[in-house]
C-alpha cells in the first residue's frame, strides 16, 4: 500500500516517502522508488535553518550600515545574519531592520536602564528626594544634597527637576 | 542455501511462446523485487523486466524491447518466479537468468542470480 | 534510457598488475552505479554497489570510484581466478541499463 502519512523528517511526494533536505541544504530532486532525496549545500551568502524540501535557499540579511546597522554574528548555511545597531543607536524592530538614535530621558526623569543595540533607554520619573535636571541617554536620578550632613539647612526645597538650596542656620534664637 | 534455479528454456519457432521458471529457497521470496535479465549468445546483459514485492503490490516493469509480449509473475507460495515470453523474435535468443533485485535507497543492485537458461529462437 | 558506455572493450593483463576499468553514463547517475563480475558460462556476480560499496564477500583489492557520469573499477593486484568480464549498471533510471562489457585476459 502507498504510504498516506510519513515519518518525522520525510515528506510524501508521487506516493513515496522522501528525506527532507537538513539545515543548510537545498532540494535538488524528490527521491524515487530507487533512489534518495538528492541535497545540494547552500551557498557562502545563503541559508536554510530547517529540515526541508525548498529548492532555493534564502540569502542572508544584508547588514546596511546606511540605516545604522553592523553584523552582530555572521550567517553560516543553516544560520541567518544577525544584524545589530551602531553605538548610539538601537532597532526600531525584533527583526531589527533599521536604528534610531536611543532616547534621552527628560529632566524630571532619570535612566532606569541604558540603551542596547536592541532596546531604547528606559525612563522612570524621579521620585521623591531625588531629581534630574538633565535631558540625558546615561544620567540616573540623583539624590537631594543633604543639608543636614553639611550643617545647613534647606533654603529651597527640591524638585524632580532641581535639588534642594542648602544655607546657614538662622544663628538668632 | 540462498539460491535461484531457472528452467524452461530450449528451442521454440519465431512466434511462438515460452514460459521460464525460477526456483527461490533460503530468503523470504515475497520481500522481493524479483527480475529477470537476458544475455545473447557473446553479447552483453539486458535488463528485460521485474516485479515488485508484497508491499507494493507486486506490480510489474518491462524493458520496451519485451513490454506487451512478455509477462512476469510469481508464486510466492511456491516461492517461484515466472517469465511468460509470447509472440517470440530471433533476437530474443539468449540466456535468460532469473535474478533478485535488492537494496535501499542509497543503491539497488542484482545481489543473486540464477545459473541461466537458454531460450533460443530459430525456425 | 541512459547509456552506459566500458572502456577499454578488452584489455590484457599479468597478475600482480593495477586494473583499471571505466564506465561512462549518458547523464548525471548520481552513484546509482554498480559492477558485475560474470566469468564464462556462469551467472554474473555482483563485486560494487552504489559506486563505492563492496559487496559482501567480495575481496578488498576490488574497489570502485567517481561521480556524476564518470565511474571506474580498479582491481589493485589481478589475481588469476579476476580474469572474467566486468560489467556497470545504472540503478538511477528505468530502464536499468549495463555497460556493453569489458574482458580482461591473461597477458
Known amino acids: 500500500e502507498p504510504p498516506t502519512a510519513c515519518r518525522e523528517k520525510q515528506y510524501l511526494i508521487n506516493s513515496q516517502c522522501c528525506s527532507l533536505c537538513q539545515p543548510g541544504q537545498k532540494l535538488v530532486s524528490d527521491c524515487t522508488e530507487f533512489t534518495e532525496t538528492e541535497c545540494l549545500p547552500c551557498s557562502e551568502s545563503e541559508f536554510l535553518d530547517t529540515w526541508n524540501r525548498e529548492t532555493r535557499c534564502h540569502q542572508h540579511k544584508y547588514c546596511d550600515p546606511n540605516l545604522g546597522l553592523q553584523v552582530q554574528q555572521k550567517g553560516t548555511s543553516e544560520t541567518d545574519t544577525i544584524c545589530t545597531c551602531e553605538e548610539g543607536l538601537h532597532c526600531t524592530s525584533e527583526s531589527c531592520e533599521s536604528c534610531v538614535p536611543h532616547r534621552s530621558c527628560l529632566p524630571g526623569f532619570g535612566v532606569k536602564q541604558i540603551a542596547t543595540g536592541v532596546s531604547d533607554t528606559i525612563c522612570e520619573p524621579c521620585p521623591v528626594g531625588f531629581f534630574s535636571n538633565v535631558s540625558s541617554a546615561f544620567e540616573k536620578c540623583r539624590p537631594w544634597t543633604s543639608c543636614e550632613t553639611k550643617d545647613l539647612v534647606v533654603q529651597q526645597a527640591g524638585t524632580n527637576k532641581t535639588d534642594v538650596v542648602c544655607g546657614p542656620q538662622d544663628r538668632q534664637r | 542455501e540462498v539460491q535461484l534455479v531457472e528452467s524452461g528454456g530450449g528451442l521454440v519457432q519465431p512466434g511462438g511462446s515460452l514460459r521460464l521458471s525460477c526456483a527461490a529457497s533460503?530468503?523470504?521470496?515475497?520481500?522481493?523485487?524479483m527480475s529477470w535479465v537476458r544475455q545473447a549468445p557473446g553479447k552483453g546483459l539486458e535488463w528485460v523486466g521485474f516485479?515488485?514485492?508484497?508491499?507494493?503490490?507486486?506490480?510489474?516493469e518491462y524493458a520496451a524491447s519485451v513490454k506487451g509480449r512478455f509477462t512476469i509473475s510469481r508464486d510466492n507460495s511456491k516461492s517461484t518466479l515466472y517469465l511468460q515470453m509470447n509472440s517470440l523474435r530471433a533476437e530474443d535468443t539468449a540466456v535468460y537468468y532469473c535474478?533478485?533485485?535488492?537494496?535501499?535507497?542509497?543503491?539497488?543492485?542484482?545481489?543473486?542470480w540464477g545459473q541461466g537458461t537458454l531460450v533460443t529462437v530459430s525456425s | 534510457d541512459i547509456q552506459m558506455t566500458q572502456s577499454p572493450s578488452s584489455l590484457s593483463a599479468s597478475v600482480g598488475d593495477r586494473v583499471t576499468i571505466t564506465c561512462r553514463a549518458s547523464q548525471g547517475i548520481r552513484n546509482y552505479l554498480n559492477w558485475y563480475q560474470q566469468k564464462p558460462g556462469k551467472a554474473p556476480k555482483l563485486l560494487i554497489y552504489y559506486t563505492s560499496s563492496l559487496q559482501s564477500g567480495v575481496p578488498s583489492r576490488f574497489s570502485g570510484s567517481g561521480s556524476g557520469t564518470d565511474y571506474t573499477l580498479t582491481i589493485s593486484s589481478l589475481q588469476p581466478e579476476d580474469f572474467a568480464t566486468y560489467y556497470c549498471?545504472?540503478?538511477?533510471?528505468?530502464?536499468?541499463?549495463f555497460g556493453g562489457g569489458t574482458k580482461v585476459e591473461i597477458k
Open positions: 516485479i515488485r514485492n508484497k508491499a507494493n503490490g507486486y506490480t510489474t
Open positions: 533460503g530468503f523470504t521470496f515475497s520481500d522481493y523485487y
Open positions: 549498471q545504472q540503478g538511477i533510471n528505468l530502464p536499468w541499463t
Open positions: 535474478a533478485r533485485y535488492g537494496g535501499l535507497k542509497k543503491g539497488w543492485y542484482f545481489d543473486l
